[in-house]
């Protein structure tokens, strides 16, 4: 049965962050694992993909990843299927929105002493907690003339008076993070002596060494004062600038200019307006330094004509969010058509050959521009340059069969011989252009050959028949030196093949005719009873009309085959004594004797003082030691044949005589005593 070792479990996840649903199975045989989301199979994308048996999320998406995931393991052989427990994500997210006027219906209806309700359009999960600000100052709940309803994200001012005038913003925070209103609401209830916001500073993102400008304006009667502060509460004026803000200028209209911005200048700037009466108005804006990271590399892609394909460009991390666009041949792609950009994706619909080339994904923001190329190849079905032709190839020579095709990408060519794939080896070689080389053509190479040229777009094939032009040759060539045993029957075969069946005849090399007891029967030389006179040089001649004749010379030797007169015997010797292994052979030519001891030939010239081989072939070993034990082989050989015989040699310790044994007691085995 299929058993889940690790099951996916429901878990918290953060919007845009990584996540992993684990799944591990154990089964008697191999299984394949796939995932379901709300009962439908999950397709791999660059954002969400199978990683082994688990499901990996590069960036959780609250819309696409909401639902129930299940891991399914299937043994395709038996059909058994097991399903994991269901798992889902509790996706935490937060999304900014504007501050809007909920009551009254329009700004024109706002009058002193009316009730004003503002709504904060920041949403998220879990439900965030809201904080309201007027002119950048937090409003605490329960103050006398306003109420905050967190459930409905509302701020109610009752009754609204001039002291409520100002720029209203909201922020919300949850377990996921925090966000502030993307657009704020300016409430203006006239009290001429109160400072009122005319122009509020906005958050600014600038590139390093560029300039940043914050605008800030208040109005009141008499005119209000305006002061700028940086994070550490240091006032910024044209007369007294903090050391790290030497390049700051405050203009008469209240605007603050920072030139050649450096990282240390990033932070929160506060603009404070104070009227003759009423509270000071504090407005905040943040200066961010622009940044952009590098882009990941693309793998080259191969597509087939007629299909639809997409290439996703993941934008690099950056501030502000980099804009992404695709270009081809230096031209920006449109947002519709056959080849177009959709979101961050390059879309090629109904792909044509002309779509091949380099496409570039660009990403840019204030910090700079990044680009990454992707090479797209459009595969085409191969076309013929040269098909294989029916061919006549000469035996023994190299033979070539062409299979020249063209396509994109370069086609792969495989060859079949008799419908079986040819794997490259010492005889067959397929060149880069598809040509097949048969290194040394043999008779059985005469058959059908088929080449197939393929790309991902398709394949073409053609076949050709090879006819082998057989050369006139001996099959097999006769051995140039052969021995016949004296006084015995002997045969010397000679056969040949060619394009036409050759005729074969034997003759003596000196031109003399064959004696009557020697017959030439269809190429086989037959000796009824070998005599000494039969020795000599013979020639086998094979001939046919188209190819002429070939000759093979054979020297026949008449020999008396080897027999052993004396063979070595199983021998046991006391350590330190001398061992004698006798061996004598006879034959004609007279055989030579060699010894092999413990699997190596004993070279008479390198035997050392302890070993000696006598003229008659016997081997003597003096002062034997235990390591001399083993099998010894006597090899007798002459130019006609070779024979061997072997015997073991045992070296034993000399026994210490016991009192019970008389001096004449024989040893328990055959012994050489010296």
């Amino acid at each position: 049965a299929i058993v889940f070792i690790k099951q996916p479990s429901s878990q918290d996840a953060l919007q845009g962050r990584r996540a992993l649903l684990r799944c591990e199975v154990e089964a008697p045989g191999p299984v394949h694992v796939y995932w379901l989301l709300d009962g439908a199979p999950v397709q791999d994308t660059e954002r969400r993909f199978a990683q082994g048996s688990s499901l990996s999320f590069a960036a959780v998406d609250r819309l696409q990843d909401s639902g129930t995931f299940q891991c399914v393991a299937r043994d395709d052989v038996t059909g058994e299927e097991a399903r994991s427990a269901n798992a889902s994500f509790n996706i935490k997210w937060i999304e900014a929105g504007p501050v809007v006027l909920k009551h009254p219906a329009s700004e024109a209806e706002i009058q002193p002493q009316t009730q004003v309700t503002l709504r904060c359009h920041i949403d998220g999960h879990p439900r965030p907690t809201y904080q309201w600000f007027r002119d950048g100052t937090p409003l605490s709940d329960g103050q006398s003339n306003h109420t905050v309803s967190s459930k409905e994200r509302n701020l109610t001012l009752r009754p609204a008076g001039p002291e409520h005038s100002g720029l209203y913003s909201c922020c919300a925070h949850s377990a996921f993070g925090q966000a502030c209103s993307s657009q704020n609401f300016t409430l203006s209830i006239a009290d001429e002596s109160f400072a009122r916001v005319v122009l509020a500073p906005q958050d600014v993102v600038v590139a390093r060494y560029e300039e940043a400008m914050f605008h800030c304006q208040f109005s009141a009667q008499p005119p209000p004062s305006l002061q700028w502060l940086f994070e550490d509460e240091t006032p910024i004026t044209n007369r007294s600038r903090p050391p790290h803000l030497r390049r700051a200028t405050v203009f008469a209209n209240g605007s603050l200019l920072l030139t050649q911005v450096r990282p240390r200048n990033a932070g929160i700037y506060r603009c404070i307006g104070q009227g003759q009466r009423g509270p000071p108005i504090i407005l905040e804006a943040t200066l961010h330094l622009a940044e952009i990271e590098d882009m990941p590399l693309f793998e080259p892609r191969v597509f087939t004509a007629g299909s639809e394909e997409r290439v996703t460009c993941l934008p690099p991390k950056g501030l502000p969010e980099p804009s992404v666009w695709w270009e081809h041949a230096g031209v920006r792609l449109p947002t519709h058509g056959r080849v177009y950009q959709k979101g961050h994706e390059l879309v090629l619909a109904n792909i044509a050959e002309s779509d091949a080339g380099v496409y570039t994904c660009h990403a840019a923001n204030l910090a700079g521009q990044r680009r990454q190329d992707v090479n797209i190849t459009v595969a085409t079905v191969p076309s013929w340059l040269k098909k294989p032709q029916d061919s006549q190839l000469e035996e023994g020579k190299p033979g070539y069969l062409d299979c020249l095709t063209q396509a994109t990408p370069k086609p792969t060519v495989v060859w079949y011989r008799n419908q079986m794939l040819i794997s490259e080896d010492s005889r067959f070689e397929v060149f880069k252009n598809g040509t097949l080389r048969i290194n040394s053509v043999e008779v059985y190479d005469g058959t059908w050959y088929r080449c197939m040229s393929s790309t991902p777009a398709g394949s073409i094939e053609a076949q050709a028949r090879v006819q082998v032009l057989e050369k006139l040759k001996f099959t097999p060539p006769p051995q140039p030196q052969q021995c016949m045993e004296f006084d015995k029957e002997a045969t010397v075969p000679c056969s040949a093949t060619g394009r036409e069946k050759p005729t074969i005849k034997w003759e003596r090399a000196d031109g003399s005719s064959l004696p009557e007891w020697v017959t030439d029967n269809a190429g086989t030389l037959h000796f009824a009873r070998v005599t000494r006179d039969d020795a000599g040089n013979y020639t086998c001649i094979a001939s046919n009309g188209p190819q002429g004749q070939i000759r093979a010379h054979v020297q026949l030797t008449v020999a008396v085959f080897i027999t052993f007169k004396v063979e070595p015997e199983r021998t046991t010797v006391y350590q330190g004594h001398t061992a004698l292994l006798q061996c004598e052979a006879q034959g004609d030519p007279k055989p030579l004797i060699q010894w092999k001891g413990k699997d190596r030939i004993l070279d008479p010239t390198k035997l050392g003082p302890r070993m000696h081989i006598f003229q008659n072939g016997s081997l003597v070993i003096h002062d034997v030691a235990p390591e001399d034990s083993g099998r010894y082989t006597c090899i007798a050989g002459n130019s006609c044949n070779i024979k061997h015989t072997e015997a073991p040699l045992y070296v034993v310790d000399k026994p210490v005589p016991e009192e019970s044994e008389g001096p004449g007691s024989p040893p328990p085995y055959k012994m050489i005593q010296t």
Partner: antibody, heavy 112, light 110 residues
């Protein structure tokens, strides 16, 4: 003994409908996936569709709309409902559990 | 639509021959290895030989072997026996619980 037996084949007119049954014995359908495969006379095998252990079904593109796979776990039987039949649907229809356990097949002939 | 192409469609060989059948898919199979090979004799249901590209099913002789990955696969019979003359099919499994067969390769006596 684990085995599959198809039934319900026969002669049907073009445009007609037919329901094939595949009765399983020796195992419970609710733990296994079941395939329907067909083979026209003298032709190759053609995958029709699959019903998985939860009862979800998936079909070859040509079978969508006309063919429906279902099951009755109490009867341990899988069904193939075929509508708007054509002459080219004439074939032996096999049911199979996984890759190796196949039924003997049932012949469906569509002819007027 | 997924297309699986077997080659050759027919193949003549002799007992003792080494035989190779190839199977090409128009898209990669699931996990790059969800491919099976069957043998079918006339009037019989198909018989599983190899599953997951290269695993030999129990009872199948070791002269049968499979290899490949992604969209290209081969079935090899190392030394053809008299019982091996039949029709052979490849079957691929794909993302989304979709399966498809090749058109078959008929192996006959030369």
């Amino acid at each position: 003994e684990v085995q599959l037996v198809e039934s319900g084949g026969g002669l049907v007119q073009p445009g007609g409908s037919l329901r094939l049954s595949c009765t399983a014995s020796g195992f419970s359908l609710s733990n296994y996936v079941m395939n329907w495969v067909r083979q026209a006379p003298g032709k190759g095998l053609e995958w029709v569709g699959i019903i998985d252990s939860s009862g979800s079904t998936y079909y070859a593109s040509w079978a969508k709309g006309r063919f429906t796979i279902s099951r009755d776990t109490s009867k341990n039987t899988v069904y193939l409902q075929m509508n708007s039949l054509r002459a080219e649907d004439t074939a032996v229809y096999f049911c199979a559990r996984g890759l190796y356990l196949w039924g003997q097949g049932t012949l469906v002939t569509v002819s007027s | 639509e997924i297309v699986m192409t077997q080659s050759p469609s027919t193949l003549s060989a002799s007992v003792g021959d080494r035989v190779i059948i190839t199977c090409q898919s128009s898209q990669s199979v699931y996990n790059n290895n969800l491919l099976a090979w069957y043998q079918q004799k006339p009037g019989k249901a198909p018989k599983l030989l190899i599953y997951y590209t290269s695993n030999l099913h129990s009872g199948v002789p070791s002269r049968f072997s499979g290899s490949g990955s992604g969209a290209e696969f081969t079935l090899t019979i190392s030394s053809l026996q008299p019982d091996d003359f039949a029709t052979y099919y490849c079957q691929g499994g794909y993302n989304g619980n979709i399966y498809a067969f090749g058109q078959g390769t008929k192996l006959t006596v030369l």
